[in-house]
């Protein structure tokens, strides 16, 4: 038995930050579980880490780096991320595995979610165009 | 005006345990990532634990997972550290600190700090 | 975890002098660097933020500049206030780290 995963096909890091939900087929309130946020096709890398047991305070960490939080529903687990670099865009998988009360269970993979992070550009003012070019 | 009074510190034998509060003032403290960040002596500055502003998320360093415990009481405007299964390397002065929740790892206002001595 | 090397370690100079402080970091941080001013038995005072903005409050002797792996604290013109130590800090990636501090002492 798996659970069912739910994530936007598609989401734009503005300002290099992001919230990513994850949506699954199971209540994780009462429960011992790990839900985690990996990068690339092969989910090669594991971005961030949320722990939760028992509807007690989450426990977050990163073992790559990446600056990130995470929020509990019932159901969903919401990751966000903060100072996402543009080279960061790719596709990112969520995550579940619970491990009290038995059996443990884990999710079929889900479709992903491409994050496009977006630089910060500085464009010229139309009021002040930049010089122009003969 | 912006404070943060930390107390709680003191001499512990290793292995110990102490409870360091924080009392904030002069914002709105629910709204802020809050940190915890400790100095040994003569040494630099290491960060420690943060929560979040509701208090519903924590991380700590390696050094103190597992044996450290970050929590607050949005209501009493107080921050707190547990601190389990000390060590003579945590003797230090722990300092809370405040974060916006638009940066949560800038530091912007830092309490006076609460020394913690592990010695036997 | 992101290294921040902070040089020279002390830095010995007179009331009025210029003082040029560098953190160097162990890969990119971007701008998301921060300096703080550090007074024996006080607690540190935040500065600059994201390698060149001064915090509220902070007189305009104080700039910043760098980005990526390296970064400047320029303080134009010692004030006799200014003499302490000095630390960078990262948040670009988890988890913050500081330099070990730069000690700006009167000559």
């Known amino acids: 038995n798996k659970i069912l995963v739910k994530q936007s096909p598609m989401l734009v890091a503005y300002d290099n930050a992001v919230n990513l939900s994850c949506k699954y087929s199971y209540n994780l309130f009462s429960r011992e579980f790990r839900a985690s946020l990996h990068k690339g096709l092969d989910s090669a890398v594991e971005v961030c880490v949320v722990y939760g047991n028992y509807s007690q305070q989450l426990q977050v960490y990163s073992k790559t780096g990446f600056n990130c939080d995470g929020k509990l529903g019932n159901e969903s687990v919401t990751f966000y991320l903060q100072n996402l670099y543009v080279n960061q865009t790719d596709i990112y998988f969520c995550k579940i595995e619970v491990m009290y009360p038995p059996p443990y269970l884990d999710n079929e993979k889900s479709n992903g979610t491409i994050i496009h992070v977006k630089g910060k550009h500085l464009c010229p003012s139309p009021l002040f165009p930049g010089p122009s070019k003969p | 005006e912006v404070q943060l009074v930390e107390s709680g510190g003191g001499l512990v034998q290793p292995g110990g345990s102490l409870r360091l509060s924080c009392a904030a003032s002069g914002f709105t403290f629910s709204s802020y990532w809050m940190h915890w960040v400790r100095q040994a002596p003569g040494k630099g500055l290491v960060w420690v634990s943060r929560i979040n502003s509701d208090g519903s998320s924590a991380s700590h360093a390696d050094s103190v997972k597992g044996r450290f415990t970050i929590s607050r009481d949005n209501a009493k405007n107080t921050l707190y550290l547990q601190v389990n299964g000390l060590r003579a390397e945590d003797t230090a002065v722990y300092y809370c600190a405040r974060a916006d929740s638009s940066s949560w790892y800038k530091f912007d206002y830092w309490g006076q700090g609460t020394l913690v001595t592990v010695s036997s | 975890e992101i290294v921040l090397t902070q040089s020279p370690a002390t830095l010995s100079l007179s009331p009025g002098e210029r003082a040029t402080l560098s953190c160097r970091a162990s890969?990119?941080?971007?701008?998301?660097l921060a300096w703080y001013q550090q007074k024996p038995g006080q607690a540190p005072r935040l500065l600059i933020y994201d390698a060149s903005n001064r915090a509220t409050g902070i007189p305009a002797r104080f700039s910043g500049s760098g980005s990526g792996t390296d970064f400047t604290l320029t303080i134009s013109s010692l004030e006799p206030e200014d003499f302490a130590v000095y630390y960078c800090?990262?948040?670009?990636?988890?988890?913050?780290?500081f330099g070990q501090g730069t000690k700006v002492e009167i000559k």
């Open positions: 890969q990119s941080v971007r701008s998301y």
């Open positions: 800090q990262q948040r670009s990636n988890w988890p913050p780290t």
